[in-house]
Interface confidence: low
């Protein structure tokens, strides 16, 4: 499996580095995190992509003023966006 990888980037432009995953990795994972107050004010946004042995959390998670979206896929360089 190959996935795109990056850590805490502001834009997808910085998340286009392909990585050969370990044979323990079944998934490409994209973690999109943002902080703000509802949909009105956004304090920041970060994007991380990685290979992973599992899909960590199958649905989006909302924790107070922070929200995190996690998406998983299982094909060659599938975590493009």
């Amino acid at each position: 499996l190959m996935c795109f990888s990056c850590l805490n980037q502001k834009s997808n432009l910085y998340c286009l580095k392909p990585t050969i995953c370990s044979d323990q990795d079944n998934y490409c994972v994209t973690v999109s995190a943002s902080a703000g107050i509802g949909n009105l004010v956004t304090f920041g946004h970060s994007l991380s992509k990685t290979c992973s042995p599992a899909c960590p959390i199958p649905e989006g998670v909302n924790v107070g003023v922070a929200s995190m979206g996690i998406s998983c896929c299982q094909s060659f360089l599938c975590n493009f966006s």
């Epitope: 370990s22 323990q24 990795d25 079944n26 992973s52 042995p53 599992a54 199958p58 299982q74």
Partner: antibody, heavy 123, light 106 residues
């Protein structure tokens, strides 16, 4: 909390078979590769088998010492992993641990361990 | 198979002192080395993963370093509860454990 509980160990004679089991709870079992690690009395740790998940066709991997004799399998509906041990040898006598990674931390390491089940092979 | 040569096999040291042990891989394993602690009669516990990352809840006195073929695990300010056997393990190609280092309290 994550829990792994092994059972099914016991005393068997050389060349006999035994199937041990591991019941998992506290995490999404179907998305995680599972492992068996053993430890002979007074000796070190030895990884022996791994089974991956359904999307990769439950791929299995074995240590050379057990290849062809041991078979790892899983039942995702029951959150169970098994180790079928055939043609047992005296050197297979050990504590058998079931182990799993903590994928929430993004580690592949053996973060979770059961208490072990003891397999004795003796005539 | 990759062989992990761990040294020393045992070490006797006083509480409060610093313990260092090493693991040498027979080939390059990158940073794919973990360290485990096993107390007598208990299951192993993960302390360090990917050579230098402390696992959740592990005290700061446990540290790991290294890459490629040479890895080091250190316990600074040894505590009585650290009496155990410590194993390195590579996960680069399948999985291989070192033979272990037994830490005894002097």
């Amino acid at each position: 909390a994550v829990q792994l509980v092994e059972f099914g160990g016991g005393l068997v004679q050389p060349k006999e078979s035994l199937k041990i089991s591991c019941a998992a709870s506290g995490f999404t079992f179907s998305t995680v590769a599972m492992h068996w690690v053993r430890q002979a009395p007074g000796k070190g740790l030895e990884w022996i088998a791994r089974i991956r998940t359904k999307p990769v066709n439950y791929e299995t991997y074995y240590a050379d010492s057990v290849k062809g004799r041991f078979t790892i399998s899983r039942d995702d509906s029951k959150s169970m992993v098994y180790l079928q041990m055939d043609n047992l040898k005296t050197e297979d006598a050990a504590m058998y641990y079931c182990s799993a990674p903590n994928y929430y931390d993004g580690t592949y390491s053996f973060a979770y361990w059961g208490q072990g089940t003891l397999v004795t092979v003796s005539s | 198979d990759i062989v992990m040569t761990q040294s020393p096999t045992s070490i006797s040291i006083s509480v409060g002192e610093r313990v260092t042990m090493n693991c040498k891989a027979s080939q390059n394993v990158g940073s794919n080395v973990d360290w485990y602690q096993q107390k007598t009669g208990q299951s192993p516990e993960l302390l360090i993963y990917k050579a230098s990352n402390r696992y959740t809840g592990v005290p700061g006195r446990f540290t790991g370093s290294g890459s490629g073929t040479d890895f080091t695990f250190t316990i600074s300010n040894l505590q009585a509860e650290d009496l155990a056997v410590y194993y390195c393990m590579q996960s680069d190609t399948k999985y291989t454990f070192g033979a272990g280092t037994k830490v005894e309290i002097k």
